[in-house]
Structures are given as structure tokens and as C-alpha cells.
Interface confidence: low
């Protein structure tokens, strides 16, 4: 059987090393060895390429070394297959050197920013000493900010052959470290370099982006002062390793600037207190590049009415969200602060508070927030510097069943009625919204029964129990989950109500 | 504490080669470049290559293109500068010094090695 | 090859006078000029990096003005301990190329 005509010729020229081609099929049924035909010199001459030894046989690759290779030159390539039954010959192919020559990657040798200049980083790179000196080269710039995966890319060509290449990646995010590579190839070749070896830079540290300031209010103390709680952070858009060295806070009472008091903090929250008045706080961050714009803030009068324009409140969850969207009767209002705690017995360990403009929505990912946990979330209308009267909804993220069930006692027992009394069950015990409580009782060796009653009872009476007879009670907790009992208790019915028993004495 | 420790005097014949080491102490060669400079008695300062520790990839001035080889070895954390050929003007101090690409200046320079050539 | 061109080769300056060395580069080196200075029998050490960034610990009476191709390095109120030879080099192309050196003498 002849062997299968070489098809599929594939060839690179590799700057100043050799000249290879490559065929399908890569293996033939029976020994078969190829000869590679190669005209050069545009034609003007011809030699070949031989795999017939034992080592290179049935090996579809073959390579022209140098002196032989010309460059620039068209050369054409036909490859024959030959086994002992004969000879098969490929098509006749042509290949343009220039278009199929292969370099070496660059090498970056400085990644640096450029005093003065934001956001922007200077690579230098030391073109590949194989390289043709008189090509065009053509280069992909990769990369990436150190924390991701996502590469980005920029293409571009430079022509400078006589010292170290230079580009101004621009467009970056301050202050931040970016993984960078390079690779490139002659302008008109299909065949990139690999890529250099990465190096790392650091973009400029850049003065600090404006604050989002917010406040909570706290009730006045005996001595007339009133607690304000100051926190702030970064706007919305700042760069996320911008490098505060500290803040400057001053605030004073309206119309009366004479009364200016300042702090300066590291922290991103303060504790002020103010007189009963109106009064304007200001923050600004700093760093050795200088401050931000200022942050402003009014702290109503103790007295002062507040508008109220939210007249409902919804929250719901998706796959990954908890959404919480409201409705406005004020058309004018188009910013809201956002605030969000766990609703737990004891003063709240994390409050978190967002700014929401432009928009009658606040989503939040579930992973955000502890499953299990009762969060109280707050709205507030904003209009220019008044703040209105919040509207407030607790959610879960998760339901659970309650860890723990209503403790349940008995109390006013009759001859055929009961009446039964439970606690809440504590908040941090819920796990979920209670829904509903529902009392599971059963006379010794009798039947059970069951009341369920709604989440906002916490006290209920059983009627047509059977007189002097002992039964046992417990009463179960409900989420949407699932519900827990609480401890079993025992009662027994009265033989003679107190009261007939009572009336009876009397005669 | 960041240093660079070369190697100690060396007299060698003319014609012969040296090679003066530079051991690092503090930091990891493969994060940095390491050049080499020289200074001939009472003269300013001559830069002859750089190596890239993590790759082995070196660059050349066109004066010591041939004659100076760089190498560096990163698991004892040392460079190393081959010259051969040597010749009454090679007499100097040699110099190694870290040049770490993101903030592109020598911050750390070594002790330097005198080379005398003399028959 | 860059060529660094230091002025002048030697100068001698009173404590508390300033010292001003310039450096001038053949064809634009932006901002890539380092300066060193090297005391007698020891290594070089960094000044000023990126023609104008103090380098670590080293006194703000040190400065550094220029881009393009013409550099100065300023050292106000001068102090006995300034004395050495002070260089320029260029990172900017290979081969990085330094400057013939400046003797700051101290009178």
C-alpha cells in the first residue's frame, strides 16, 4: 500500500535557528520515510530535507539549518512519502519567510511609574537580541492587577531598533500593583514570541477620594448632651488600596463658626457630643499627597421635624440577594441612606450603612450577611442636607428552625380549662421569623391534640379538657423552616372548680 | 539586614580571567537584577552588564561585550562576573550592585573587589 | 552610547553655602537620572533617583531638578561630612552610562 499523501505542510521559520516544516499523518502503518523538497534563494535554488535514518523515520518534521537559510526569501516546500511500495507527493507550498518567522520573547526590565504622571505605568523591555534589526515589531502587552486572574491586553508596534523599548500604559487604578508581560513578533509574521517573563509594578499612591459621611443619633443624656456617632469611608469608586494616614474633623454650631471644635483620628469613626442646636460637621482624609474634598454633614436640632416621604417598605430574597425596595411620595428625593445591623439583644457588634442614589432599590449579596440572623434595615430620605424620617423592615437571609423552644408554663387551672402562657424565645435563638406557635397537649394515655395560634400570642386557654385528669403539654415554635419544642410540662385538671367548691362552703 | 558580600583582592596574570562573586544577604536575587560596575584608581564609575537572576538573561556594554561573562547561582543567592583576557587597563574596583525594576534605581551596592593585573 | 556630562569637575564650598552640580545628558534621558555620591574607599551610595525622589534617610538639604536633558543636584548649607566625589548615571538606554564624577570639597 502507497503511503498517505503528506498533507496539512506546516512551517516556521525561527529567527536565525532553522527552518522547519511539519505533515500529517504523523504515523504511518508501515515504515515509511519522507524527503522535504525546498526551493530557495526566490527559486534560484534547491536542496533537501531527509528523514529516512533510523532515529528520524516516520517522524513528520523536518528542519534546514543554517547557512542555507535566507532571509528575506520565498521558498516553496513539497514533501514525498516513501514506503516499499512506492512514493506519494504532496502538494507544492509556498511560504514567504517574513510571514512565518518566529522571535524570541523581549524582556522587561523596568515596570515603574512616572513621577508626576497618575494612574500610569512606564515598561521598558530590551528588544530580543534574534530579531531582524530592520522589522517592524509588533507587541502584546499583558496584564493584570496583582489579586486577579483576568489578564487584559494592549497591541501596539514600535520601530526603534537602537536602544531599550519604552510604553506608557495608561488608564490604570492608583496606588495599585499590576502583573505585566510581553510577547511580540515581526509585523507581518502569524507566529507570536512566548511571552517574557512577568514582572511587577506599582502605579502611584494618588491624595485621597472624597468621604460618604453618615451619623447615628443617639438619645439625649441627663446633662442635655446628645451622643452623635460620626463614621465615614471612602466614596463609592475609590481606588481600594488608596492609603489614608489620617482625618480631620471639625464641627461647630450653626451661624456660629466662633465654636469650631477639631479632632484629628486614624479611626473611621468618632463619638461627638453636641448641644441641642443645629450643627455641620466636616471630614476630610489625608495622605502625603494631601486631603480630599470635604465630607459635610447636618445634625438636625434636637427639636427640629422631620419629613417623612417613604410609605412602604419591602424586602425580598433572589438566589444570591436580599433585595429591599421602597416606595416615595416624594418625587424630589433621589438619595437614601441605607443602614443595616443584626438585631440582636445586646448593643449591635457590626453596623454597616450605604448610600444609594438615582434609585428606590438597595440589594446586598446573601454572603454578605450571617444566615440565621435577624437584620434590622433602615431607609432614609435624603434632600440635599436635611434628613428624613426613616422607614424600617428586619429580614433574614436564611431561615433556620429555632434552636431553642418557647419555655411554656401553665396557669389559672380549672376542671375543664387550662390557660397556657410562654415566653419569647430569645432573639438570638429565633433563627428565623416566628410565624406561628402551636400547643401540642394530651391527656395520660389519651389522644393528642394541637392549637396553633399566631406569632403575636403568647398566652392561650383550653377549654373542654376532662376533669381530674393529668396531661402533658408542650408548646412548639415555628420559622419557615421548621418549628422546635419547648419543654414538657404536666398539669393535672381539678376534680371541683375552687369557685363551686367556694359556693358550696357559703351554704 | 539587606547587603551584597563580594569576594575578596585578587591579583592575576595578564591574559588570564577572574571571576569575583557576589553573595546577597536579606533579600532574593530573583526579585531583582544584579549590575556590575567597575572604577579604575582615581576614575569615575564604568557600567559593564546586568543579569537577570531568574532567568539567566544578560545584558552587555558594547566595550565588555565578549569579555565579560554574568552568571548567577539563586540557590546560594550569588552573581557572579567572569572577565577574561585581562590586561593592564582591567586593574579596578569591581562593583556589584542591586537594581530592583519597580522603583529602577541601585539601591544596594556591594563591597567591591580590587583585581590587579601584574605578571 | 549616552553621554553624561558632569560640571564641574571639582568644587570647594564653605559649611553652610550651597553646592549646586549639573549634568548633562547628550540626547533625552526624561527623567531617568540617578545620583550618587561616593566617599573615599567606600561603595557608591544613592542620593536621588528619577531625577528629582530622595532616596531614603538621605537629608532633605539634598535636591534633585532636571528632566530631559539637563540635571542639577543642589545640597543646601553644606556640612563637613558632604565631602566626596558625587555622580550622575543615566538609566534611561543601554548602555547606562555615567557621568565623570564631581569632587566636593569642603573648605
Known amino acids: 500500500v502507497l503511503p498517505a499523501k503528506p498533507e496539512n505542510i506546516s512551517c516556521i521559520f525561527y529567527y536565525e535557528e532553522n527552518f522547519t516544516c511539519t505533515w500529517s499523518p504523523e504515523k504511518e502503518a508501515s515504515y515509511t520515510w519522507y524527503k522535504v523538497k525546498r526551493t530557495y534563494s526566490y527559486g534560484y535554488k534547491s536542496d533537501i530535507c531527509s528523514t529516512d535514518n533510523s532515529t528520524r523515520g516516520n517522524h513528520a518534521s523536518c528542519s534546514f539549518l543554517p547557512p542555507t537559510i535566507t532571509n528575506p526569501d520565498n521558498y516553496t516546500i513539497q514533501v514525498e512519502a516513501q514506503n516499499a511500495d512506492g512514493i506519494m507527493k504532496s502538494d507544492i507550498t509556498y511560504w514567504n519567510l517574513d510571514a512565518i518567522m518566529k522571535i524570541e520573547p523581549p524582556e522587561i526590565f523596568s515596570v515603574k511609574s512616572v513621577l508626576g504622571i497618575k494612574r500610569m505605568l512606564q515598561i521598558k523591555w530590551i528588544r530580543p537580541v534574534l530579531a531582524p534589526h530592520s522589522s517592524t515589531l509588533k507587541y502584546t502587552l499583558r496584564f493584570r492587577t496583582i489579586n486577579s486572574a483576568y489578564w487584559m491586553e494592549v497591541n501596539f508596534t514600535k520601530e526603534d531598533i537602537d536602544r531599550d523599548e519604552t510604553y506608557n500604559l495608561t488608564e490604570l487604578q492608583a496606588f495599585t500593583e499590576y502583573v505585566m508581560t510581553l510577547r511580540c513578533a515581526p509585523a507581518e509574521s502569524m507566529f507570536w514570541s512566548g511571552w517574557s517573563q512577568e514582572k511587577v509594578g506599582t502605579t502611584e499612591e494618588e491624595a485621597p477620594y472624597g468621604l460618604d459621611l453618615w451619623r447615628v443619633l443617639k438619645p439625649a443624656m441627663v446633662d442635655g448632651r446628645r451622643p452623635v456617632q460620626l463614621m465615614w469611608k471612602k466614596a463609592t469608586g475609590a481606588p481600594v488600596l488608596e492609603k489614608a494616614l489620617g482625618y480631620n474633623i471639625w464641627y461647630f454650631p450653626e451661624n456660629n463658626t466662633n465654636l469650631t471644635e477639631t479632632v484629628n483620628t486614624t479611626n473611621q469613626t468618632h463619638e461627638l457630643y453636641l448641644g441641642g442646636k443645629t450643627y455641620w460637621v466636616y471630614v476630610v482624609s489625608y495622605n502625603s499627597l494631601g486631603e480630599s474634598p470635604v465630607a459635610t454633614l447636618r445634625i438636625p436640632a434636637l427639636n427640629e421635624k422631620t419629613f417623612q416621604c417613604i410609605e412602604a417598605m419591602q424586602a425580598c430574597l433572589t438566589q444570591d440577594q436580599l433585595v429591599v425596595e421602597w416606595q416615595s411620595s416624594a418625587p424630589e428625593v433621589d438619595t437614601w441612606m441605607v443602614e443595616w445591623f443584626p438585631d440582636v439583644d445586646s448593643e449591635p457588634s457590626s453596623f454597616s450603612w450605604e448610600s444609594v442614589s438615582q434609585a428606590r432599590n438597595w440589594t446586598i449579596q446573601k454572603d454578605e450577611l450571617k444566615p440565621l440572623w435577624c437584620y434590622n434595615i433602615s431607609v432614609y430620605p435624603v434632600l440635599r442636607d436635611r434628613v428624613g424620617q426613616p422607614y424600617s423592615t428586619q429580614a433574614y437571609v436564611q431561615e433556620g428552625i429555632p434552636s431553642a423552644g418557647p419555655v411554656t408554663q401553665a396557669d389559672s387551672i380549672g376542671v375543664k380549662t387550662v390557660t397556657i402562657t410562654w415566653k419569647e424565645i430569645p432573639k438570638s435563638k429565633r433563627n428565623g421569623f416566628i410565624k406561628n406557635y402551636t400547643i401540642f397537649y394530651q391527656a395520660e394515655d389519651g389522644k393528642e391534640f394541637s392549637k396553633t395560634v399566631n406569632s403575636n400570642i403568647l398566652q392561650y386557654r383550653l377549654e373542654s379538657l376532662t376533669r381530674r385528669t393529668s396531661y402533658s403539654l408542650q408548646v412548639m415554635a415555628s420559622t419557615n423552616a421548621g418549628g422546635t419544642n419547648g419543654t414538657k410540662i404536666n398539669f393535672k385538671t381539678l376534680s371541683i372548680s375552687h369557685h363551686h367548691h367556694h359556693h358550696h362552703h357559703h351554704h | 539586614e539587606v547587603q551584597l558580600v563580594q569576594s575578596g583582592a585578587e591579583v592575576v596574570k595578564p591574559g588570564a580571567s577572574v571571576k569575583v562573586s557576589c553573595t546577597a544577604s536579606?533579600?532574593?536575587?530573583?526579585?531583582?537584577?544584579i549590575h556590575w560596575v567597575r572604577q579604575r584608581p582615581g576614575a569615575g564609575l564604568d557600567w559593564i552588564g546586568r543579569?537577570?537572576?531568574?532567568?539567566?538573561?544578560?545584558k552587555y556594554a558594547p566595550k565588555f561585550q565578549g569579555r565579560a561573562t554574568l552568571t548567577a547561582d539563586t540557590s546560594t543567592n550569588t552573581a557572579y562576573m567572569q572577565l577574561s583576557s585581562l590586561r593592564a587597563g582591567d586593574i579596578a574596583v569591581y562593583y556589584c550592585?542591586?537594581?530592583?525594576?519597580?522603583?529602577?534605581?541601585?539601591?544596594?551596592w556591594g563591597t567591591g573587589t580590587l583585581v590587579t593585573v601584574s605578571s | 552610547d549616552i553621554v553624561m556630562t558632569q560640571t564641574p569637575l571639582s568644587l570647594s564650598v564653605s559649611p553652610g553655602e550651597t553646592a549646586s552640580i549639573s549634568c548633562k545628558a547628550s540626547?533625552?534621558?526624561?527623567?531617568?537620572v540617578t545620583w550618587f555620591r561616593q566617599k573615599p574607599g567606600q561603595s557608591p551610595q544613592l542620593l536621588i533617583y528619577?531625577?528629582?525622589n530622595r532616596y531614603t534617610g538621605v537629608p532633605d538639604r539634598f535636591s534633585g531638578s532636571g528632566s530631559g536633558t539637563d540635571f542639577t543636584l543642589r545640597i543646601s548649607t553644606v556640612e563637613a561630612d558632604d565631602t566626596g566625589v558625587y555622580y550622575c548615571?543615566?538609566?534611561?538606554?543601554?548602555?547606562?552610562?555615567f557621568g565623570q564624577g564631581t569632587k566636593l570639597e569642603i573648605k
Open positions: 550592585a542591586r537594581y530592583y525594576y519597580v522603583s529602577s534605581y541601585f539601591d544596594v
Open positions: 536579606g533579600f532574593n536575587i530573583k526579585n531583582t537584577f
Open positions: 543579569i537577570d537572576p531568574a532567568n539567566g538573561n544578560t
Open positions: 540626547q533625552s534621558v526624561t527623567n531617568d
Open positions: 528619577s531625577a528629582s
Open positions: 548615571q543615566q538609566d534611561y538606554s543601554s548602555p547606562w552610562t
